[in-house]
Every structure is written in C-alpha cells, then in structure tokens.
C-alpha cells in the first residue's frame, strides 16, 4: 500500500539497515526509495530535546511485514518509501538548505557569486554530490563567497551541522541539468584499469552500466562476461572512479566490456529498469518466496508486485507436472543484485520492474512502427497532439508534443491571435482529425507560456509550453517523448521523422490522417548557405533533402521532429519555419530543443 504522508513525532522501532544524514525528512524518504532494501525510515529533525549529534539522521529500515511498531518521540519524523507507490519518482532535489553545513570530502574550493552559481558548478562537476556555500554575510572574511564541492561514498552527507550564514544543496545531475557529456558507448574487449569502488554481479554489460549510473561514486565500469577466462570473475561488474573522472588506462582484454556512467543521460534513457529476461541463467540471492507461475513473464509480474522482491529465477515446469506451472523464486540481496549468477541450469532470470517508475516515462519502448508510407498508424507517435482553437469556429491550429503529464511543447508562432488559453483544446491519441467530434475528450489549457525572447519565428526562440488543466494518464496512444540530454549535444541523429496534419503542398488543406516523413538533419553551416538572408543560430536545427520533396508544411508547426537514438525517441526539434514547403535546397528550420532544456525545466518545475 502506498503511504506518502509523513508521521510527525513518530519513530519506527527496529528494522535498521543503515543510517545516513539528510537535510530533511522529505529527502530521507527519497533516499529510502532509492535504497535497494529500505521500506520505512525514521528521520530526526533539529530539536532542543534531541542530542545535536542525532539531528538530521535518516535511519533506513526494512521489515518482512512491510511495517514496524510505532513509538512516540518528539522531533522524529517517520514514513514509508515510495517503492510501494505506482507514481513516477525522481531523485531531483532543487532545495537550498539555509544555515546547514553538509559534511563530506571537500575536494574543490572556489569563489562563486551566488549559491545558484555554486550549485551549477557542482552539477557540472563529475565528482560532486553536494555543496556548501558561505554567503557574503559569513563571519570569516576569507571564507565569504566560497563554494565547497563535496562528495562521499554514499552520495549523502557524512554529517549535517547547523552553521550560520551558509547554504547547502545537492547536485542537479538527477534533474537532467548537467552539461557533462553523455557517453553511451560500451567498449568491447576493454578493461578500465582504475580503482574499484564496488563490485556487483550483473547478467550483462548494460545492466552493469545502469548499476554504475545510480551508484553515487561510479563514473565508469568494467564488466567481465560469462566467457571471461577466470571463472570466479565471470559476470562481475566492477564500479570504478578516478581523480580525473576518466579512465587513466585502457587495457585490451577479450571478453571484457567497459563503459561510462549514464548520469548525464538519465532523463532520456532507462537507467533503473532492467526489463530483459536472461535465459539459461540462475540468479542466486536470499529467497523471499517460491510460487507457481505459468511463465517467466508471470514470474516477473509476481516479483514486481512483491515490494521486497529485487530479482527472480523461473524454472519452467517439467513435462506435465503442476498444471504446466513452473517455479518462480522471488529473491533479494543487500544491494539489489544477485550474489552469484550461474549458467546452464535451465532457469530464466530477470529483475523487478518496480524500479522502472524511477526512469522517465518517455523512455518506455513504443510498439514497432510501420516503415515506409506517409500515413501514420495508431500509436506510432503517441506524444503527438493536435492543438485546436475554438474561435471563431473549431479548427486544427498546430501540432505539439507531450513532454510531461501536464505539459505540451509547441511553437510560439502558433499563438498568433490567440488571446486566451480558454479557446484552446489539446487532443491526444488522435490519428484522424475526423475522430474529433463534439463529445471527444480533450485537455483544456490553463496557461500559455511563450519564450520571453520570441519575436518572430525566423529570429529564433520559437518555443512555447502549454500547461494543461488536467493531467494526462499515459497509455499506449498518449505518452511523453524524451527531451534530448544536454550531454547529447554532439550526438549525430540519423533516424529523424517529422509528423503532423499539415498541408502536403503549399496550396492545400489540413490532412485528415497524421502524416510522417523521414528527413535527414542538415548541418547549420549547410543550412546557413541555403538561407543567406537569415541568421541560422545554434538554437535552430535544420532538416531536409537537398532535392526537396519531403518537408513539414503549414499546419505542422509546433509539432515534433522526433529522432530515435539508442532505441529511445527524443524531441530534437519543433517545426518552426522554412522557405515554402519541400523546396529544393531549402531545408525546414526547427527550434533546437536541446538548447532550451533549461528553459523548459525552469518553467515546468516552477513551484
């Protein structure tokens, strides 16, 4: 059962796993949620009745029954992890804590103009977990405006103390705000020879990479495959770090794979969700339960629904015994990974999908698409919406993209003459405009947020957000698209599509069926040559065929330029402007979304 509220002056008795320090009970709850075993916690707030050495302690707890006895204690705040909840979870913590010094290893000290600048510095430093900033009112003159970047083994402070005129906060890497590079490549036949901070068992290099990503100290990893010569090291995932943040030595070794933490890509690829099945593989660990199940998929469901289950092994039924049901072994361990992985025993293993809700919804795979043809099929572009105006009569105005459960991203120029959000309707999950009848459900618009610097499409900043009056329930036909990671600025996208109900030629009408066209990206230098009278800025991105023929057109405005990268779709562009439609040597010009990620997050995460 999902319990989100905090219990004041209440302490859970027993069940202690470990103690960490957090600046608030709210953050203690987040830490508990992300811990592999924690189900409950007790946080001690600052209080005159409490020993100051116990202030800010966050005791992570576990219980076979998923609950513990409650005891009254002043200044104690207790609660449950969000593991038991179905809603989306994020580790992003933008809070700034006044008069708190969060202790850790101070590895970098520099002058900063503000706490915000200090936080940005921490976010863009590969080692930084949190920071403390001495304000200009700090008593010691030589420490004023000093920004201390800190890290610890756990990613949380080793202690928290009260200290006047300082502020502390966390890195915003988990808010997708880091400018650090996102290196997705896995290097075969490579060992990174740097210090190991931890080791776990993993079935493949991808799981190893994802474990590295949410391990606070891991910057890169080496994985020894099941063909690795040394038997005791097979399936071993070594989590590594280095002072420089990069591997110092790469050794060529067969049957080993290495890669980097995906910390800077985590909002656009799954990092918690290990959804694959591993055939002829047994995961060993502490047994939680053994239940009968019809298939390995059913076994995974049972594990996902059992809050303490972390992974499972399914042994298919022998011939006709037990009504064709196999045995489903639900398991757990101290760190969420198997204690050993065995092959050749006929088992099928996998992980709980409970952690998938810690990943961005946009990373969920959508159903396979039909290649070729210009008409889309239902569910092919589930983030695409049609934006209608009802004044003076109802009509399609522009396209848009679902980027959050209350947010549509579109183009600013769509709102010419739109004097109030009241006249707008957003329809999602639509394939044909003819589906839209008087009684078709829609989302009302609460607010139109146009970029402050927008003047005209051709000069850039052609971007707008629509805040919906109600939230979108994600389904196969309506779900968000990922924003590109800032760390992905150098990615070369090769699988890009423009979609919309717009004209198919310059003098035409709105199409009934959602159209799609695969269009190659064009470099800004090439695009600039085609638009000599304009300034093609880095905040624009161009796409089109040299010979023309395929392009966005009137009515497609505001819709997505969607690019598939590493099996995940990203909103790379917003249809903005161009000379005519599909003309030779006149590419379409799109708003370059990656350049507006900060703006989008600032507007959508505003309190």
């Amino acid at each position: 059962e999902c319990v989100t509220q905090l219990l004041k002056d209440t302490c859970f008795e027993g069940g202690d796993i470990t103690t960490v320090f957090t600046p608030s009970a709210k953050y203690c709850q987040v830490v508990c949620t992300y811990h592999p075993r924690c189900l409950l916690f007790t946080f001690t707030a600052e209080s005159p009745s409490e020993d100051p050495t116990r202030w800010f302690t966050c005791v992570l707890k576990d219980s076979v029954t998923e609950t513990l006895p409650r005891v009254n204690r002043t200044a104690a705040i207790s609660g449950y992890s969000f593991k038991q909840c179905s809603h989306q979870i994020s580790a992003c913590n933008k809070d700034i804590y006044v008069d708190l010094d969060m202790k850790g290893i101070n590895y970098n000290s520099s002058v900063a103009k503000s706490a915000q600048e200090c936080q940005e510095r921490c976010t863009d430093d590969v080692h930084c977990h949190f920071f403390t900033y001495a304000t200009r009112q700090f008593p010691s003159l030589e420490h004023r405006n000093i920004c201390l970047l800190k890290h610890t083994q756990t990613g949380t402070p080793t202690r928290i103390t009260k200290l006047d005129k300082v502020v502390s906060g966390f890195s915003l890497k988990s808010c997708a705000l880091s400018n650090l590079a996102c290196i997705r490549d896995i290097f075969p036949n490579t060992v990174f020879a740097d210090s190991n901070i931890d080791s776990v068992m993993a079935p493949d290099a991808f799981v190893c990479g994802r474990i590295c990503t949410h391990h606070p100290g891991c910057l890169f990893f080496t994985f020894f495959s099941q063909e690795w010569p040394k038997e005791s090291q097979r399936n071993l995932c070594l989590l590594k770090t280095s002072e420089s943040g990069l591997p110092s030595t790469r050794i060529k070794k067969s049957k080993a794979l290495s890669g980097f933490s995906l910390q800077s890509c985590r909002h656009s690829i799954p990092v918690f969700c290990h959804s694959s099945f591993y055939h002829d593989t047994d995961f060993l660990g502490e047994e939680l339960d053994i239940v009968a199940a019809k298939s390995h998929e059913a076994c995974q469901k049972l594990c996902t629904n059992a809050v303490r289950c972390q992974f499972f092994t399914y042994t298919p039924a022998q011939a006709s015994c037990n009504e064709g049901k196999g045995k489903c072994y639900l398991k757990l361990s101290s760190n969420g990974s198997p204690t050993k992985i065995l092959h050749g025993r006929g088992g099928i293993s996998g992980y709980t999908l409970r952690l998938c809700k810690m990943d961005n919804e946009c990373t969920t795979k959508i159903k396979p698409r039909i290649v070729g043809g210009t008409a889309s099929v239902r569910g092919e572009w589930p983030w695409q919406v049609t934006l209608h105006t009802t004044s003076p009569t109802q009509r399609h105005l522009c396209g848009g993209s679902i980027i959050g459960n209350q947010w549509i991203l579109t183009a600013a120029h769509c709102f010419y003459g739109v004097e109030s959000p009241k006249i707008l309707r957003v329809y999602s999950g639509i394939l044909n405009q003819s589906e839209i009848k008087e009684d078709t459900s829609f989302f009302g618009v609460q607010e139109i947020i146009i970029h402050d610097q927008y003047k005209m499409a051709e000069s850039g900043y052609d971007i707008a957000l629509l805040k919906l009056e109600t939230t979108v329930n994600y389904t196969d036909s309506q779900r968000p698209i990922c924003l590109p990671s800032k760390g992905d600025r150098n990615v070369i996208y090769t699988d890009c599509w423009v979609t919309g109900w717009g004209y198919r030629k310059l003098r035409d009408k709105i199409q009934n069926t959602l159209q799609k066209a695969k269009i190659p990206l064009v470099t800004n230098e090439e695009c600039q040559k085609r638009y000599r009278g304009h300034k093609i800025t880095h905040k624009m991105i161009c796409a089109g065929y040299r010979e023309g023929g395929k392009d966005a057109c009137k009515g497609d405005s505001g819709g997505p330029l969607s690019c598939k990268h590493n099996e995940v779709w990203h909103l790379v562009g917003i249809t903005s402007w161009g000379e005519g439609c599909a003309q030779r040597e006149r590419p379409g010009v799109y708003t370059n979304v990656v350049e507006y990620v900060d703006w989008i997050l600032e507007k959508t995460q505003a309190v």
Epitope: F415, Y416, G417, K455, A457, E458, C553, G555, S557
Partner: antibody
Framework: QVQLQESGPGLVKPSETLSLTCTVS????????VHWVRQPPGKGLEWIGI???????YYNPKLKSRVTISVDTSKNQVSLKLSSVTAADTAVYFC????????????WGQGTLVTVSS | DVVLTQTPLSLPVTPGEPASISCRSS???????????LEWYLQKPGQSPQVLLY???NRLSGVPDRFSGSGSGTDFTLKISRVEAEDVGVYYC?????????FGQGTKLEIK
Amino acid sequence: QVQLQESGPGLVKPSETLSLTCTVSGYSISTYHVHWVRQPPGKGLEWIGIMWRDGDTYYNPKLKSRVTISVDTSKNQVSLKLSSVTAADTAVYFCARGGTLTTPFTYWGQGTLVTVSS
Amino acid sequence: DVVLTQTPLSLPVTPGEPASISCRSSQSLESRDGNTYLEWYLQKPGQSPQVLLYGVSNRLSGVPDRFSGSGSGTDFTLKISRVEAEDVGVYYCFQATHGPFTFGQGTKLEIK
C-alpha cells in the same frame, strides 16, 4: 481590466524632443509587447516602433534616427521620445498592446494629440 | 518597406447592402512560419482603432460574423455581408510579416 493611457505635453516646439508616456494597468508591462502608432490630423495610421517584452526595441527605419522607446517596469510605463521634431510630426499618438504575440493590437490607448508649433 | 494599397479610398454603402474593400501588398505577406500576418482594423469617428480580423480571415471574439476576410499572398479582401450604421469609419489593412510594419492608407466607409 486592461487599460493604456498616453500622456505628455500637447505642444512641442520645432527642433525639440517630443516625450510621451504610456501607462498601462490591468497587466504587467513585461508580459506583452507595446507599440507606438501615430495619425496626423485627417490622415492614416503610421507605425512608429515596438518595445518587445524582453526589453528590445525595433523602430520604423523612416524615424529610426530620431526615435527612442524605453520601459520603466517599476512604473508599468513605456516612453516614446522623438527628437528634432517638425510640423510633420504633428499627430495623435497612440500606444497599443500586442496580443499573445507581437500583433494584433488588441488594446489601444485613447490617443494624445501633439502639435509641433513655435 | 511593404506598401499596402487599399481600394476604394471611399465607399458609400446603403444599410443592409454588402461592402467589399481590397488590400494589395507590394510583396507576399505569407510568413515563412506559415502564418499570414495581415490584419484589418476599423477606426470609428473620434475613437481609437479596433481590430476586426487577424491572419487574413480570423475574427477576434466579439467581432460580428458579418465581417469576413479572404485572400492570400498579395491580394486580400475584407467583406461586410450587410452593412449597419455602426460600421461607419475608416478601415485599415495592416501587415506584420515584414519589418517595418505598415498600414494601408485607409478606406472610408460611409452610409448613403
């Protein structure tokens, strides 16, 4: 409700600078664009320039060398200055608010007549 | 600069009869973003102008449906299906596609 009100001297001497203020109420000046438009007596409308909501300005090139539009967000005001005026600058001066985007002009001030005469 | 030429300059109409005003542009007003930033304003005697239509043919809320607009590229028309006494004034077309923004010279509609 939204209102725009032009104010300033009704009489300006030739070669001097015409200064007008547009005070808005019912919304924050920094959330919409403000335009200045003028209309000589018995003639048509002429667009003078715009104060974009981000503080940038754009002027009619015909008047660019003489015109300055500025904003005072604390007072919710946009000002127009036109230097080296001549009798040809005698007109009713309007400020108008752009829509969600630059135009259409959804709200207008009532206009103020400025006569250039010695 | 874009020149907007309105015809006729004066338009006497009998109440209940239709009226039509043309606005011709010296260059296409179709913006590269797909919008056509062509608007029509009415300035009634002694008043500030008021917007009637934007984007060639879109009526703003509160504008009677007897006003309609059409056209594309360089040729645009404002039509009043049945003129009423309150429609008297000067009608201006206006473009915001190309800088500097420009008005037509105006068409004076009067009742016969």
